[in-house]
Interface confidence: low
């Protein structure tokens, strides 16, 4: 790496993957192992993220970009840049301090994450329960028996499943 020649700030010419080394007359030095600089002109390199424990490496650190982690099977990412891993549960369960527990009667969870939520109260909408709820599925509401005239069949379908990776927060 040749010495930078900028008259204003000699460090501004140091590219990503290097740092401006004050100890060596502001020469652009390569980032040491396990560190990176993603932009030019930096006076230090940042320490690479380490994916350990329940985290596993999705993308190795390079001299110009940080490592990226995801979660080991059975866990899912939470937070910006997968800053946290949370344990998966089965549908019909929610995560508690002591692990996955079945949803209580009257609640359900149709995902591997998130909390158990109460079944829809059909009567609030003046409807009746057409299909009973389970730990994994909400009830299906339909017209109340009085509304069912011959030939009519207006059933409210269950809410569409949420996209994977989106849980109610």
């Amino acid at each position: 790496f040749e010495r930078t020649r900028s008259l204003q700030d000699p460090c501004s010419n140091c590219p990503a993957g290097t740092f401006c080394d004050n100890n060596r007359n502001q020469i652009c030095s390569p980032c040491p192992p396990n560190s990176f600089s993603s932009a030019g002109g930096q006076r230090t390199c940042d320490i690479c993220r380490q994916c350990k424990g329940v985290f596993r490496t999705r993308k190795e650190c390079s001299s110009t970009s940080n490592a990226e982690c995801d979660c080991t099977p059975g866990f899912h990412c939470l937070g910006a840049g997968c800053s946290m891993c949370e344990q998966d549960c089965k549908q019909g369960q929610e995560l508690t301090k002591k692990g996955c527990k079945d949803c209580c009667f009257g609640t359900f969870n149709d995902q591997k994450r998130g909390i158990c939520r109460p079944w829809t109260n059909c009567s609030l909408d003046g409807k009746s329960v057409l299909v009973n709820g389970t730990k994994e599925r909400d009830v299906v509401c339909g017209p109340s028996p009085a509304d069912l005239s011959p030939g009519a069949s207006s059933v409210t379908p269950p809410a569409p499943a949420r996209e994977p990776g989106h849980s109610p927060q």
Epitope: E86, L95, K97
Partner: nanobody
Framework: EVQLVESGGGLVKPGGSLRLSCAVS????????MSWFRQAPGKGLEWVSH????????DYADSVKGRFTISRDNARDSLYLQMNSLRAEDTAVYYC???????????????WGQGTLVTVSS
Amino acid sequence: EVQLVESGGGLVKPGGSLRLSCAVSGFTFSDYYMSWFRQAPGKGLEWVSHISGSGTTIDYADSVKGRFTISRDNARDSLYLQMNSLRAEDTAVYYCAREDIRMPGTTDFDHWGQGTLVTVSS
């Protein structure tokens, strides 16, 4: 930078004892619940125990209750797991983890150590 470093693992005979340590740095240790997890060969991660920041709230998985004791020394930024009456099924890599309580009913373990291997075998 948050760091957690476990030590104290090793080979021990059934019925024996080990004390695991987890030295932490990079955050105010006493502000956080801490947990021990373990992962047996070919199995999933299992929560073992946790302790509140002040050490007043402690809980254990049923599988270790009465045999394992969790403790912490906030002055030394250290977490411990005393394991007695060890069994073959306790063989696992043991991890300490920092708990981040984000909302009621949701606990995320946002920082982990590298793990220490405990082998219980005659």
